[in-house]
Each structure stands twice: as structure tokens, then as C-alpha cells.
């Protein structure tokens, strides 16, 4: 005859307040004859949780029909869990006796603990923008979870980050815990469209991690490159000079032209285009009048980007004698 085993498969059961907890218990034999009862705790002060034969247990239901002759499943469900329900639950087999039943065998017990989901991770980036090739730090915080075991990963786009430091507080016992992690990442010139992602995995999330994101567009400043060129073609007595401001971010930009050191107030034509990496190009055209009296014209394109120090590029205008002749010929 097979010896009776009481099987409680879960050593630990995490439950959330207000939900229903299922405590599993199966037996390997129908013998000896007698009931299976559920208790919380051990020893003389243990609390009766469920007895099929007597008592009223409004929050407890059985998973199987215990009245069935060959039933070997004595699992129960406890509804509307509260913090007062935590503890270790035992299913215990009694042998039928007279005048009263005698305890025969106990299961190993299932510890019911309150699990709390972590809050959605919040990712914060640096307070000020930084240029490519510099290191920036991002912090990720999530709160209110239990138990303490938690996994946090960092990604830049799809690639994991490896330079981070993570702390879970408090270190001792607590009803809820918080995690804070700081990741360091070097900015690439194309990071305007990049994202930093903090991913938190916890037993209460059933394999569906929570994610918090930060856009690197808020942390990066890509300084512009400037190029000033003189167009070979001219219109009447005017020469077209172009200032190309390339690959900058953010969009905030002020451009001024000056002629021989004097700032020009007149309107100039310009276009703004967005590159596929999220940076911008700005092209400004400046028309310079050519006359016999103007031998050495120095044009300066000055750009102030995102509140930084102004950068400028100069161009000494090349006006050939031939061009001057043409211009005087064309003048009525």
C-alpha cells in the first residue's frame, strides 16, 4: 500500500491585496480514511482556515468537489486578500477516530506573502544638454514593490547598457521597496532620435516588464558646422553668397551676416531642412552689390546655436575685373 504524501507544490505564494489566492494541496492516496483540514501556522495556536465538515468560512472555497468519492485535490481559494492573511498555510490529513480524529500527516506548507507591483519606472536625464562623445547620466526610479528581488536593465535603443549602478532600499525587511539606478552612456552624433529605456522585471508582473523611457533629443546638443561659399553665377551687379549651417540640434539658431564688420539688417533668403538622423541644416543666401568702389569685401556668417558662444566663418569676396566690367556695362 502506497504511503500517503501531502503535496503542496508552492513554497511561496505571492498575492496582492484584494485578489484571490489559490493554495494547492493534493494527496497521493485515499487512505487512511479521514478529512483534510487547512491551518495557518503550526503548534497549539495554529488557526483553522478551512474544515469541510464544520464551521463557516465565507472567504474560502474549494477548487474541487470534496464530496466526490475519489477526490485527491484539496486545494482552496481565499478571496479578498488583506495584509492580515500573510503566513504559512498547511494542509493536514487527519485519520478518522473516536471520539475524535487524529492528525496523521501535514504538508510542507505554503508561505503566503504580499506581493506589490513596482510603479512605472521614471527615467530622468541630465539637466543640461551635452555634445556628442561626452558621457551623460540617466536615473531610473521605481517604488512600492515587494518582495525585494527585482531586475533592472538599461537599453539605448535595442542595445543593452553595461555602465550602471543600482540600489534597492531599504536593505532590511520592509513592506515595500524602491529601486534607483543610474546609467552612464556616451552620446553619438546621431543620437537625436535615440531613446534610453529602463526596464524593470518583478515576480508580480508575470513576465511582462515595465518600461520607462527618455529621449536623448532632450540631452544632446549637436553643434553646427559652417561653410561660406561664393556662387560662381551672378545676377546683374549682385553676387550670391551662401552660408550652410549643417548637422545641428536643437533647432534654436540665430544667423547674422556682416559686411566688413558691419551687421547687415536687410532680409536674406533661407531654408531649413531636417536630416534623417534628426539634426537640421540651415542655408542662408546673401546678395552683395558689386561696384567699382568695392575692392575688398569680407563677409562673415555668424551663428549662435542654442545659447552657446557664437561661431563664425568669413569669406573674402573675389570680384574679378571682368566681373566689374560686366557690371558697369550692364548699368544704364
Amino acid at each position: 500500500e502506497e504511503e500517503l504524501q501531502m503535496i503542496q507544490p508552492e513554497k511561496l505564494l505571492l498575492v496582492t491585496v484584494g485578489k484571490t489566492a489559490t493554495l494547492h494541496c493534493t494527496v497521493t492516496s485515499l487512505l487512511p480514511v479521514g478529512p483534510v483540514l487547512w491551518f495557518r501556522g503550526v503548534g497549539p495556536g495554529r488557526e483553522l482556515i478551512y474544515n469541510q465538515k464544520e464551521g463557516h468560512f465565507p472567504r474560502v472555497t474549494t477548487v474541487s468537489d470534496l464530496t466526490k468519492r475519489n477526490n485527491m485535490d484539496f486545494s482552496i481559494r481565499i478571496s479578498s486578500i488583506t495584509p492580515a492573511d500573510v503566513g504559512t498555510y498547511y494542509c493536514v490529513k487527519f485519520r478518522k477516530g473516536s471520539p475524535e480524529n487524529v492528525e496523521f500527516k501535514s504538508g510542507p506548507g505554503t508561505e503566503m506573502a504580499l506581493g506589490a507591483k513596482p510603479s512605472a519606472p521614471v527615467v530622468l536625464g541630465p539637466a543640461a544638454r551635452t555634445t556628442p562623445e561626452h558621457t551623460v547620466s540617466f536615473t531610473c526610479e521605481s517604488h512600492g514593490f515587494s518582495p525585494r528581488d527585482i531586475t533592472l536593465k538599461w537599453f539605448k535603443n535595442g542595445n543593452e547598457l553595461s555602465d550602471f549602478q543600482t540600489n534597492v532600499d531599504p536593505t532590511g525587511q520592509s513592506v515595500a521597496y524602491s529601486i534607483r539606478s543610474t546609467a552612464r552612456v556616451v552620446l553619438d552624433p546621431w543620437d537625436v532620435r535615440s531613446q534610453v529605456i529602463c526596464e524593470v522585471a518583478h515576480v508580480t508582473l508575470q513576465g511582462d516588464p515595465l518600461r520607462g523611457t527618455a529621449n536623448l533629443s532632450e540631452a544632446i546638443r549637436v553643434p553646427p558646422t559652417l561653410e561660406v561659399t561664393q556662387q560662381p553665377m551672378r545676377v546683374g551687379n549682385q553676387v550670391n553668397v551662401t552660408c550652410q549651417v549643417r548637422k545641428f540640434y536643437p533647432q534654436s539658431l540665430q544667423l547674422t551676416w556682416s559686411e566688413n564688420g558691419n551687421v547687415c539688417q536687410r532680409e536674406t533668403a533661407s531654408t531649413l531642412t531636417e536630416n534623417k538622423d534628426g539634426t537640421y541644416n540651415w542655408t542662408s543666401w546673401f546678395l552683395v552689390n558689386i561696384s567699382d568702389q568695392r575692392d575688398d569685401v569680407v563677409l562673415t556668417c555668424q551663428v549662435k546655436h542654442d545659447g552657446q558662444l557664437a561661431v563664425s566663418k568669413r569669406l573674402a569676396l573675389e570680384v574679378t575685373v571682368h566681373q566689374k566690367d560686366q557690371s558697369s556695362d550692364a548699368t544704364p
Epitope: N157, E160, L161, R184, W190, R193, S194
Partner: antibody, heavy 124, light 113 residues
Framework: QVQLVQSGAEVKKPGASVKVSCKAS????????MHWVRQAPGQGLEWMGW????????GYAQKFQGRVTMTRDTSTSTVYMELSSLRSEDTAVYYC?????????????????WGQGTLVTVSS | DIVMTQSPDSLAVSLGERATINCKSS????????????LAWYQQKPGQPPKLLIY???TRESGVPDRFSGSGSGTDFTLTISSLQAEDVAVYYC?????????FGQGTKVEIK
């Protein structure tokens, strides 16, 4: 030249653990990520996880989470990969492989060079 | 996870002839902001560890003969051996490093016809 030398073959029983070592030479050990990749007999390559030898941080493929532990000893430029609760399906050649530079913080996942491999056989 | 599928599974080519191996990913490996494809190719000879041939889909690792070339973008990639040599008999793997977990193709075995 850059070299990764791994520990010798191991035979383990189901349920046991195995710890494979990988000693690096020819470069600054803490400057590059280290990865572990395994290959079951006659099968393809399977990435297991990474380690940052500078910080000691690790990241594991979901499949191995909870069973794999990667550690390092910077004094000997050695990384270790421990796999627990072994089963017959874990019989494979385990490779360490150097990844990208640590300095940028991002794990660039091409691998060069590779260790010679360590055969782990799980059998009762 | 990104799934990498190679074709064919095996390939028999005459010495001096061209060998072409294809690799398809379940999602694009092109990061448009830097115009790079996050794909590598490896060669593995019997009893040896894999050896890096190509990274960024088309950049040849130093010391790799120029008969090996990588091409393709997005989800479709090709490794070409322009003139097969006896020492090229091996299994070739593609691998994505666009996002973790980093995954490999199932491998293509190249033999001499």
C-alpha cells in the same frame, strides 16, 4: 596578441552546477565586454549573456535568467560563467568571446576573438 | 526576439567559383540615424571556435581575405565568397546585434563540389 583561454572539459550530473573560466590576455581586460555563447553538438550558436569586467555588471538572455551567473576576477583577468540546475539539454561547447569597448556604455554585439571552447557534458 | 534565417542550409561549390549565402532577419537591422546595419558574419571550421569575418554588414575584419564580402540592408543580407578556396570549407553564421538577445542564423555549410 589578444587571446582568450578557457578551462578544460567537464562532465556533470543532472541537477549539478558547472563553472567555466576564461582568461584574457593581450589587451586591457576591463576595457572590453565579455560574452558567453554556447553550441550544442551539431547545432547552431546561442548567446547567453554579457559581462562588463570594469563594473561587474551583467545581463543574461531570458532563457538562462536565474540559472546563469557571470563573475570576474580583475587581478587575474579572468571571467567565469556558472550554470546551475544542469539538464541533458545543457550539453554543449561553451565559448567566451570579447565584445565591444566598455567606454561607450553600449554593448555592441559582434564578437572577436573567441575562446577555444569548453565542452560540458551533462549525463547521469 | 529577432529571428535570423539563413539560406541555403548547405551549399556545394566548385573551387574558384562564387558562393553566396543569404540571411534574412525578422525585423530591420538598419538604424536609419547612423545608416548602419547591425549585422555580423562568422566562419566556423570543424573543431574550432567561430571567427569574425564581417561586421556592420559590409566591413571586412582586418586579416580577412578580400574574396569575402558582405552586402545588403534592412532585413536581407548576403555573404559572398567570390572565388572559393579549399580552406573556405566551413559553416557560416550571420548574427544580429541590433537588439538583445543577440541572435544567430542556423548556419550554412559550405562544401566543395
Amino acid at each position: 596578441q589578444v587571446q582568450l583561454v578557457q578551462s578544460g572539459a567537464e562532465v556533470k550530473k543532472p541537477g549539478a552546477s558547472v563553472k567555466v573560466s576564461c582568461k584574457a590576455s593581450g589587451y586591457t581586460f576591463t576595457s572590453y565586454h565579455m560574452h558567453w555563447v554556447r553550441q550544442a553538438p551539431g547545432q547552431g550558436l546561442e548567446w547567453m549573456g554579457w559581462m562588463n569586467p570594469n563594473s561587474g555588471n551583467t545581463g543574461y538572455a531570458q532563457k538562462f535568467q536565474g540559472r546563469v551567473t557571470m563573475t570576474r576576477d580583475t587581478s587575474t583577468s579572468t571571467v567565469y560563467m556558472e550554470l546551475s540546475s544542469l539538464r541533458s539539454e545543457d550539453t554543449a561547447v561553451y565559448y567566451c568571446a570579447r565584445g565591444g569597448r566598455v567606454v561607450r556604455g553600449v554593448i555592441k554585439g559582434w564578437f572577436d576573438p573567441w575562446g577555444q571552447g569548453t565542452l560540458v557534458t551533462v549525463s547521469s | 526576439d529577432i529571428v535570423m534565417t539563413q539560406s541555403p542550409d548547405s551549399l556545394a561549390v566548385s573551387l574558384g567559383e562564387r558562393a553566396t549565402i543569404n540571411c534574412k532577419s525578422s525585423q530591420s537591422l538598419l538604424y536609419t540615424s547612423n545608416d548602419r546595419n547591425y549585422l555580423a558574419w562568422y566562419q566556423q571550421k570543424p573543431g574550432q571556435p567561430p571567427k569574425l569575418l564581417i561586421y556592420w554588414a559590409s566591413t571586412r575584419e582586418s586579416g580577412v581575405p578580400d574574396r569575402f564580402s558582405g552586402s545588403g540592408s534592412g532585413t536581407d543580407f548576403t555573404l559572398t565568397i567570390s572565388s572559393l578556396q579549399a580552406e573556405d570549407v566551413a559553416v557560416y553564421y550571420c548574427q544580429q546585434y541590433y537588439s538583445s538577445p543577440y541572435t544567430f542564423g542556423q548556419g550554412t555549410k559550405v562544401e566543395i563540389k
